[in-house]
Interface confidence: low
């Protein structure tokens, strides 16, 4: 019986040990599991954070790429505008210089004319006066008629002269004013992005007009909204006007006036004085006169360019400018020597 | 003895079971461990990949930001260059225009001089001839009255002539200069950012006009949606120069530039003089004059402010240009009225 009890105690102990080992193993498994779960949570969290950061960075990158693309477009447009501006200014300047030459030539011609007419008048007076004197001295017995005969030429001479001068006078302004009108007339009509209602009128850019003549309201963009549309560029009447250049040589070198781009915006909208229209302008997309541009913010930027290739060569523009300026300077110098 | 053997067998079994359980648990632990290690490796790998990607993106972002900054500088430089270019051109042009005026004036003076000399020559000849005749006739005992009758026309001639010349002279330049001024008046109308009600100040830049001639109402914004830019737009002396604008109102420059807002797109939308439409312009996308930008809104209006970190708004570079030109136009107008 003792032995039996001893053995049973032994078995009992072993069973307890088994239970202990079992629960210890279970605990161990649970602990390992917990440990791994915690570790995994940290790793997964890191991954999530990383992914979020990646998304943020990608968004920022996209945004920046879009902005960059837009900026590149801006730079390109700037170059384009600048080139056009230079071309336009050069053109205006050359027009001015040419007009100056014309004015000088006209002046010389007028002076020549006035001098010639003056000489002729003097000569003809000498002639008629010689004749008159001769007659007077010869026929003293008929005073009256002679006096009249003597008087007539006198009055006629000045008149004749007056006419000459008068012509001179009336002719002078004509070319001058015509020049300007013509020049304005030349300014090509720009078309805005929008549907233009008015001014397909030829006289659009008229300058001084005869009394009573209505002036046409201009519908032309002052220059193509730069960035915008390519073709939308106009002349800046500002200078164009200032030039009062006789555009009778429409073949004018260089850029067609169509391409004389002027700063972006500038669309003009003129109205005849008499009308009280509340013409208002809203900046419209096309208002931009830009090629493909919308500066409507990140928003509409569609340029998502990935590259950072600043292929725009911003600085060539400088060279271009320089060339143009040299050209102008030369013209100016020539002009100054005139 | 049997019982003992039985108990011992039982104990043996339990020990074996314990060993089995132990090894089973060890195996289980190893398996779990292996499983977790594999999973962890995947997660860590993901993290590493993500970190690498983050670094790549950050590098790309930094590079792009640098390039973007550089490009912004380019744009600013462009604005500056353009402003300077416009200023220079404007100056050149104003020089040319002023010179043209001078040439015209000199021409008129020379013509006047030549005419005067001619008149004087004729007058002095008339005088001496009158004297001669008087003497001759007196010698022949001819009556005095008749001589006077004959003399009158002589004296009148020069006067008449003088008048004619006078007219010739004073009228000649008028149209001529008016032409230019007028032409400037034509300078296209710029839109302000805001809805412009046409002809706010109808007489504003008016020059004298022939009776009855309608004036084009100009509704131009004082400044043009410049790039807003930096301060570069403020005034473009260029025109200012061209205008020979009396800047005795310095207050015009500077501060007001804040208000020189110009719409962003400035589309022009002109209407035939007769229409009374309340057409307004909104800054629209194309208003941007930029390739990827939309200036279609108040927003996109750029005030030609000097400061205002708006110089960053690359999208509005065009605006700046516009501002400048508007500014110029206005100055020009002011100058005309002076």
């Amino acid at each position: 019986e003792l032995k039996k009890n001893e053995f049973q105690g032994e078995l009992e102990k072993q069973r307890e040990q088994l239970d202990k080992i079992q629960s210890s193993h279970n605990f161990q498994l649970e602990s390992v599991n917990k440990l791994y779960q915690d570790e995994k949570a940290v790793l997964v969290n890191n991954i999530t954070t990383g992914e979020r950061l990646i998304r943020v960075l990608q968004d920022q990158l996209k945004t920046l790429q879009r902005n960059y693309g837009r900026l590149q477009q801006d730079v390109l447009q700037f170059q384009k505008n600048q080139t056009n501006l230079e071309r336009k200014f050069s053109y205006d300047l050359s027009q001015c210089i040419n007009q100056m030459k014309e004015v000088k030539e006209q002046c010389e011609e007028r002076i020549e004319e006035v001098t010639k007419k003056g000489n002729e008048a003097v000569a003809s007076r000498d002639l008629s006066e010689n004749n008159d004197q001769r007659q007077q001295l010869q026929a003293l017995s008929e005073p009256q008629p002679r006096l009249q005969a003597a008087g007539l030429p006198h009055t006629e001479v000045p008149q004749g002269k007056g006419n000459v001068l008068g012509n001179s006078k009336s002719q002078t302004p004509a070319p001058s004013s015509e020049v300007v009108l013509d020049s304005k007339r030349q300014v090509e009509k720009e078309e805005t992005n929008e549907i233009q209602v008015v001014n397909e009128e030829p006289q659009r850019d008229r300058l001084p007009q005869e009394p009573g003549r209505e002036q046409v309201v201009e519908d032309r963009p002052v220059g193509g909204r730069g960035f915008g549309g390519a073709g939308e560029l106009g002349q800046t009447p500002q200078v164009q006007a200032a030039l009062s250049v006789s555009q009778e040589n429409p073949e004018m070198e260089g850029p067609e006036r169509d391409q004389l781009v002027i700063p972006d915006g500038q669309e003009e909208e003129q109205e005849a004085a008499g009308e009280g229209r509340n013409q208002q302008k809203l900046r419209g997309e096309d208002d931009y006169n830009m090629d493909e541009n919308e500066a409507e913010s990140e928003t509409d930027k569609q340029a998502a360019l990935a590259g950072n290739d600043r292929n725009i060569d911003v600085f060539n523009v400088e060279d271009q400018k320089r060339d143009t300026i040299n050209l102008l300077d030369q013209r100016e110098k020539r002009n100054h020597t005139l | 003895e049997l019982k003992k053997n039985e108990f011992q067998g039982e104990l043996e079994k339990q020990r074996e079971q314990l060993d089995k359980i132990q090894s089973s648990h060890n195996f289980q632990l190893e398996s779990v461990n292996k499983l977790y290690q594999d999973e962890k490796a995947v997660l860590v790998n993901n993290i590493t990949t993500g970190e690498r990607l983050i670094r790549v993106l950050q590098d790309q972002l930094k590079t792009l930001q640098r390039n973007y900054g550089r490009l912004q500088q380019d744009v600013l430089q462009f604005q500056k260059n353009q402003t300077n270019l416009e200023r220079k051109f404007s100056y050149d042009l104003s020089q040319c225009i002023n010179q043209m005026k001078e040439v015209k004036e000199q021409c008129e003076e020379r013509i006047e001089e030549v005419t005067k000399k001619g008149n004087e020559a004729v007058a002095s000849r008339d005088l001496s001839e009158n004297n001669d005749q008087r003497q001759q006739l007196q010698a022949l005992s001819e009556p005095q009255p008749r001589l006077q009758a004959a003399g009158l026309p002589h004296t009148e001639v020069p006067q008449g002539k003088g008048n004619v010349l006078g007219n010739s002279k004073s009228q000649t330049p008028a149209p001529s200069s008016e032409v230019v001024l007028d032409s400037k008046r034509q300078v296209e109308k710029e839109e302000t950012n805001e809805i412009q009600v046409v002809n706010e100040e109808p007489q504003r830049d008016r020059l004298p006009q022939e009776p009855g001639r309608e004036q084009v109402v100009e509704d131009r914004p004082v400044g043009g949606r410049g790039f807003g830019g930096a301060g570069e737009l403020g005034q473009t002396p260029q025109v200012q120069a061209a205008l020979s604008v009396s800047q005795e109102n310095p207050e015009m420059e500077g501060p007001e530039r804040d208000q020189l807002v110009i719409p962003d797109g400035q589309e022009e939308e002109q209407e035939a003089a007769g229409e009374g439409r309340n057409q307004q312009k909104l800054r629209g996308e194309d208003d941007y004059n930029m390739d990827e930008n939309e200036a279609e809104s108040e927003t996109d209006k750029q005030a030609a402010l000097a400061g205002n970190d708006r110089n960053i708004d690359v999208f509005n570079v065009e605006d700046q240009k516009r501002d400048t030109i508007n500014l110029l136009d206005q100055r020009e107008k002011r100058n005309h009225t002076l």
Epitope: T63, T192, N193, E194, I195, G229, Q280, K281, L282, R283, G284, E285, D286, D287, E292, E294, A295, E296, S297, E298, T299, D300, Q302 | G228, D264, G265, E267, E269, N278, Q279, Q280, K281, L282, R283, G284, E285, D286, D287, Y288, N293, E294, A295, E296, S297, E298, T299, D300, K301, Q302, A303, L305, N308, D309, R310, I312, D313, F315, N316
Partner: antibody, heavy 119, light 108 residues
Framework: EVQLVETGGGLVQPKGSLKLSCAAS????????MNWVRQAPGKGLEWVAR??????????FYADSVKDRFTISRDDSQSMLFLQMNNLKTEDTAMYYC??????????WGQGTTLTVSS | EIVLTQSPTTMPASPGEKVTFTCSAS???????LHWYQLKPGFSPKLLIY???NLASGVPARFSGGGSGTSYSLTIGTMEAEDVATYYC?????????FGAGTKLELK
Amino acid sequence: EVQLVETGGGLVQPKGSLKLSCAASGFTFNTNAMNWVRQAPGKGLEWVARIRTKRYNYTTFYADSVKDRFTISRDDSQSMLFLQMNNLKTEDTAMYYCVTGGTGTFDYWGQGTTLTVSS
Amino acid sequence: EIVLTQSPTTMPASPGEKVTFTCSASSGISSNYLHWYQLKPGFSPKLLIYRTSNLASGVPARFSGGGSGTSYSLTIGTMEAEDVATYYCQQGFSIPLTFGAGTKLELK
């Protein structure tokens, strides 16, 4: 004068559809980007959608909350802007404004039209 | 999405006072893309200031704006009774275009 007149609002049941219209005048419609902005009762302003001009192929943009449910469109010949709203939710209840705008701004606003989504 | 936080939510003020509203962006934006609107009860919103500091047409000079990066402000130099309204800031830098929750200006 710039005028934007919205019409088409009303009471709709959830999951229903409705089309808002906006008649524009006083400016050159075809050159302006257009937007819809809404304001829910007691809440702030929320941009809904934007459509650019023909020059930009009528590109559209939407707020996440309406993406795939709302469609913005325009008819330049009639100077009209539209917002087709499908699968409406109660949270779409708001005053809807037709707005002109450019670089992310909203320049001119219509008087608004009310949409109520309720069962 | 760029979140704009306006403070305070409500601002009581008396006519003649100087009032300043602030608008904070969750990430930096160019000042060219921050705009302010005024919404009076019963009216449509109205553009007040665009590009941080430019007054829209018809807006009285007592309004002014400033700021850069993530911090912007709208100031009414001398408040008038007619200025009672809710003022919203808005960013146009990225889609979605977002508004702040608004600051209600009330009479004290």
